[in-house]
C-alpha cells in the first residue's frame, strides 16, 4: 500500500521513541566515527521533519523516499571528507546508488576506542541525572561498533539495559546487582551481532536464493507441524525484514518485524504449539522470543522421504515444472524430520540432491541414475559428526582456554598470514563452541556445533575482507556458504608461507600485566602465542606448550616480585633468550 | 606412567656442597619443565627451583639463589640440583616433580608426578 508520506507512515507505525531509536542506529552504523552529539543533532532533525509530515503527508519533501530524507541528512555533515575520505564521495551519487555507496563503507572493524566500563556509582548517576541521553549513548555506542546489529532486536537490548539500571541502582549492593546483569547484555550482545553479521553476509554476498534455503531449513526444524505453503509464506516475510536490516533500511526493517511476530501469533495454531508464551509478551519482547523459539515436536508417522523424492517416477517432471519450489519441499520435509542436523548440513545435502537431479535428469535412465542418492548423504553427514566428537573430546580434556590455544596453533598454521588480533578473536570464539555445545546430547550437538561455528567463521571472512592477505581465506570464504567449516577444516599447515621474523618488541611484557583481568591476561598469552607459531610454524605442539609454560612461569614470577618492572625487563631478556636458544628463532 | 627417583641425598656439615639428582622413565621427559620441591618436619612443602622443559631457564626461592643451581640432561632423561653453601635451614626432604597441564610453577598443585624424595640434613 502506496503511503503519500513514507515517512509519515513510519513515525506513525512506530511511534516517536522508536522511530527516534532507529534513526540514531541507522545514522550511527553508516557515520561510525561522528559524535554522538552530532548524530543526536541529526536524529532532532529528522525527527521534526517527520512530524511535519504526520501533521501535512502533502507537505514540502515529504514524498521523498527515506534513503534520500537520511541520505541528504548525513551529506551536510560538515567533516566527512576529513573523517571519512573517500566515503564523502558517495554524497556525489544519486539513489539508490548513493545508499549502496554508504552501506559499502560500513567498517565490521572500525578503529573506536574499547568502551570501559565506569563504576557502577557513576554509571547510576548518570542514569539518573539523563535517563533518554544514557540510553541514547548505549544504542549510538553499539550501533557504531557493530554495523550489522539487528536494530529491532538492539531496541530490545536497550530496554533490558534500561531495567538493569532502573533496578540495580535502587539496591543495596548496586554492583553485585547490575555487573552481572551487563556482562549477560554484553556477551548477548556479541552473540546477536555476529549472528545478524552471518545473515548479512548471505544476501549480500550469495542473494536472496541462499537466505532464502536457510530460512527453509530452519524454520522447519522449528516449526516441523506448519505445512510447507505456511513455512514458505514465513521464509518470504522473514527475507525481506532481514533483506530491509541489512540494506539500512531500519525503520521499514522494524515495522516489517512487527508485522511478522503479529502473524505468527495470529496463526501459532497453524506454525507450532510451542509459541504460546511468547505471544502474550510486549512487542519487542515477543520478537525476540519467537525467534528464540524451542523446536516443535516433530509430527507422529511422518512418511519416508524416499517415497517422493527418490522411488516416485514423477522427480525430475516435479523438479523441471519448479525446481526451487521442488529443492524447498525436499528441504523442508529432510529438516522438519532431523532437528538433530545443523542447518548447514541440511544446505549441503540438498545440494547434493539439487546437483544429482541436474545430471540425472538428463540421463537416459534417470531413475536408474538418482536411486541411490540417499546413499551420498551418508559421509556428509558423518564428516561433521566425527568431527565434533574428536574435538568435545579434545575439549573436555583441554578446559575452555587450552582448547582454544590448541585451536590458535591450528588456525595460524593453516592461515598465518592473517592478523595476529584477527586469530585470537576468532579462535578465542572458535573454542567457545566447546563450552556451548559439549555439554548437550548427541541429538544437539551438531546444530549447536556446526551452526555456531558457521558464524564465527563468517567473522572471520568479513575481518578478512576488509584486508585480504591470504587467497586460502579468500577461497574458503568465496567459494560456497555451506561449505565454509569444511574448507577450513580441510586446509592442513600452509608450507608455503616465511616464517615472520623474529622481533623482540612483540616478546616484551611489563608489569600492567599484573592488573589485567584474567580474560585479558589469556588474551595477551594467546597474542604470545600467535606471534611464536608465526614465527616458527615448524614447532612442535609439545615444544609450544613448553614455551607457553615459561611463558606463564615468568609472568607469575615476576607480578609476584617487589619491583615488578625491573623483573619484567631482565627476566623477559631472559626468556626471549632461552625460548630462541631451545626453537632456533 | 612417569616414575621418578632421586637420589644424592645425606648428612653434611654447614658450609658443605651436595649434588641431588632425579632420573624419570614414561612420557617424554624433554617436553615438561621441572621442578624441585622441600618439606621440613612440621612445615608444608615449599618450591626451591623450576628448570624448564629445554634447560635454558631456571626460576629459584629467594633462599636458595645464588647457592643452587638446577640444570637437566634431556638425553639422560635426568634433571640436577647442585647444592652449595648449604646451612642448617636447609634440611629437609627434597622432591622432584615434573609439570603438570596446569595451576602454578611455584606450588606444587602444578606438578603432576613426584618423587619418593630424598632426605638432606645440614648440621651445624
Known amino acids: 500500500d502506496a503511503h503519500k508520506s513514507e515517512v509519515a507512515h513510519r513515525f506513525k507505525d512506530l511511534g516517536e521513541e522508536n522511530f527516534k531509536a532507529l534513526v540514531l542506529i541507522a545514522f550511527a552504523q553508516y557515520l561510525q566515527q561522528c559524535p554522538f552529539e552530532d548524530h543526536v543533532k541529526l536524529v532532532n532533525e529528522v525527527t521534526e521533519f517527520a512530524k511535519t509530515c504526520v501533521a501535512d503527508e502533502s507537505a514540502e519533501n515529504c514524498d521523498k523516499s527515506l534513503h534520500t530524507l537520511f541520505g541528504d541528512k548525513l551529506c551536510t555533515v560538515a567533516t566527512l571528507r576529513e573523517t571519512y575520505g573517500e566515503m564523502a564521495d558517495c554524497c556525489a551519487k544519486q539513489e539508490p546508488e548513493r545508499n549502496e555507496c554508504f552501506l559499502q563503507h560500513k567498517d565490521d572493524n572500525p578503529n573506536l576506542p574499547r568502551l570501559v566500563r565506569p563504576e557502577v556509582d557513576v554509571m547510576c548517576t548518570a542514569f539518573h541525572d539523563n535517563e533518554e541521553t544514557f540510553l541514547k549513548k548505549y544504542l549510538y555506542e553499539i550501533a557504531r561498533r557493530h554495523p550489522y546489529f539487528y536494530a529491532p532486536e538492539l531496541l530490545f537490548f536497550a530496554k533490558r539495559y534500561k531495567a538493569a539500571f532502573t533496578e540495580c541502582c535502587q539496591a543495596a549492593d548496586k554492583a553485585a546487582c547490575l555487573l552481572p546483569k551487563l556482562d549477560e547484555l554484553r556477551d548477548e550482545g556479541k552473540a546477536s551481532s555476529a549472528k545478524q553479521r552471518l545473515k548479512c553476509a548471505s544476501l549480500q554476498k550469495f542473494g536472496e536464493r541462499a537466505f532464502k534455503a536457510w530460512a527453509v531449513a530452519r524454520l522447519s526444524q522449528r516449526f516441523p507441524k506448519a505445512e510447507f505453503a505456511e513455512v514458505s509464506k514465513l521464509v518470504t516475510d522473514l527475507t525481506k525484514v532481514h533483506t530491509e536490516c541489512c540494506h539500512g533500511d531500519l525503520l521499514e526493517c522494524a515495522d516489517d518485524r512487527a508485522d511478522l511476530a503479529k502473524y505468527i501469533c495470529e496463526n501459532q495454531d497453524s506454525i507450532s504449539s510451542k509459541l504460546k508464551e511468547c505471544c502474550e509478551k510486549p512487542l519487542l519482547e515477543k520478537s525476540h522470543c519467537i525467534a528464540e523459539v524451542e523446536n516443535d515436536e516433530m509430527p507422529a508417522d511422518l512418511p519416508s522421504l524416499a517415497a517422493d523424492f527418490v522411488e516416485s517416477k514423477d522427480v525430475c517432471k516435479n523438479y523441471a515444472e519448479a525446481k526451487d519450489v521442488f529443492l524447498g519441499m525436499f528441504l523442508y520435509e529432510y529438516a522438519r524430520r532431523h532437528p538433530d542436523y545443523s542447518v548447514v548440513l541440511l544446505l549441503r545435502l540438498a545440494k547434493t540432491y539439487e546437483t544429482t537431479l541436474e545430471k540425472c535428469c538428463a540421463a537416459a535412465d534417470p531413475h536408474e541414475c538418482y536411486a541411490k542418492v540417499f546413499d551420498e548423504f551418508k559421509p556428509l553427514v558423518e564428516e561433521p559428526q566425527n568431527l565434533i566428537k574428536q574435538n568435545c573430546e579434545l575439549f573436555e580434556q583441554l578446559g575452555e582456554y587450552k582448547f582454544q590455544n590448541a585451536l590458535l596453533v591450528r588456525y595460524t598454521k593453516k592461515v598465518p598470514q592473517v592478523s595476529t588480533p584477527t586469530l585470537v578473536e576468532v579462535s578465542r570464539n572458535l573454542g567457545k563452541v566447546g563450552s556451548k555445545c559439549c555439554k548437550h546430547p548427541e541429538a544437539k550437538r551438531m546444530p549447536c556445533a556446526e551452526d555456531y561455528l558457521s558464524v564465527v567463521l563468517n567473522q572471520l571472512c568479513v575481518l578478512h575482507e576488509k584486508t585480504p592477505v591470504s587467497d586460502r581465506v579468500t577461497k574458503c570464504c568465496t567459494e560456497s556458504l555451506v561449505n565454509r567449516r569444511p574448507c577450513f577444516s580441510a586446509l592442513e599447515v600452509d608450507e608455503t608461507y616465511v616464517p615472520k621474523e623474529f622481533n623482540a618488541e612483540t616478546f616484551t611484557f611489563h608489569a600492567d600485566i599484573c592488573t589485567l583481568s584474567e580474560k585479558e591476561r589469556q588474551i595477551k598469552k594467546q597474542t604470545a602465542l600467535v606471534e611464536l607459531v608465526k614465527h616458527k610454524p615448524k614447532a612442535t605442539k609439545e615444544q609450544l606448550k613448553a614455551v607457553m609454560d615459561d611463558f606463564a612461569a615468568f609472568v607469575e614470577k615476576c607480578c609476584k616480585a617487589d619491583d615488578k618492572e625491573t623483573c619484567f625487563a631482565e627476566e623477559g631478556k631472559k626468556l626471549v633468550a632461552a625460548s630462541q636458544a631451545a626453537l632456533g628463532l | 606412567q612417569v616414575q621418578l627417583v632421586e637420589s644424592g641425598g645425606g648428612l653434611v656439615q654447614a658450609g658443605d656442597s651436595l649434588r641431588l639428582s632425579c632420573a624419570a622413565s614414561?612420557?617424554?621427559?624433554?617436553?615438561?619443565?621441572m621442578g624441585w620441591f622441600r618439606q621440613a618436619p612440621g612445615k608444608e612443602r615449599e618450591f626451591v627451583a623450576r628448570i624448564n622443559w629445554s634447560g635454558t631457564l631456571t626460576y629459584y626461592a629467594d633462599s636458595v639463589k645464588g647457592r643452587f643451581t638446577a640444570s637437566r640432561d634431556n638425553a639422560k632423561n635426568t634433571v640436577y640440583l647442585q647444592m652449595n653453601s648449604l646451612k642448617p635451614e636447609d634440611t629437609a626432604v627434597y622432591y622432584c616433580?615434573?609439570?603438570?597441564?596446569?595451576?602454578?610453577?611455584?606450588?606444587?598443585?602444578?606438578?603432576?608426578?613426584w618423587g619418593q624424595g630424598t632426605q638432606v640434613t645440614v648440621s651445624s
Open positions: 616433580a615434573q609439570r603438570g597441564d596446569s595451576g602454578s610453577n611455584y606450588d606444587p598443585s602444578g606438578y603432576r608426578y
Open positions: 614414561g612420557r617424554t621427559f624433554s617436553d615438561y619443565a
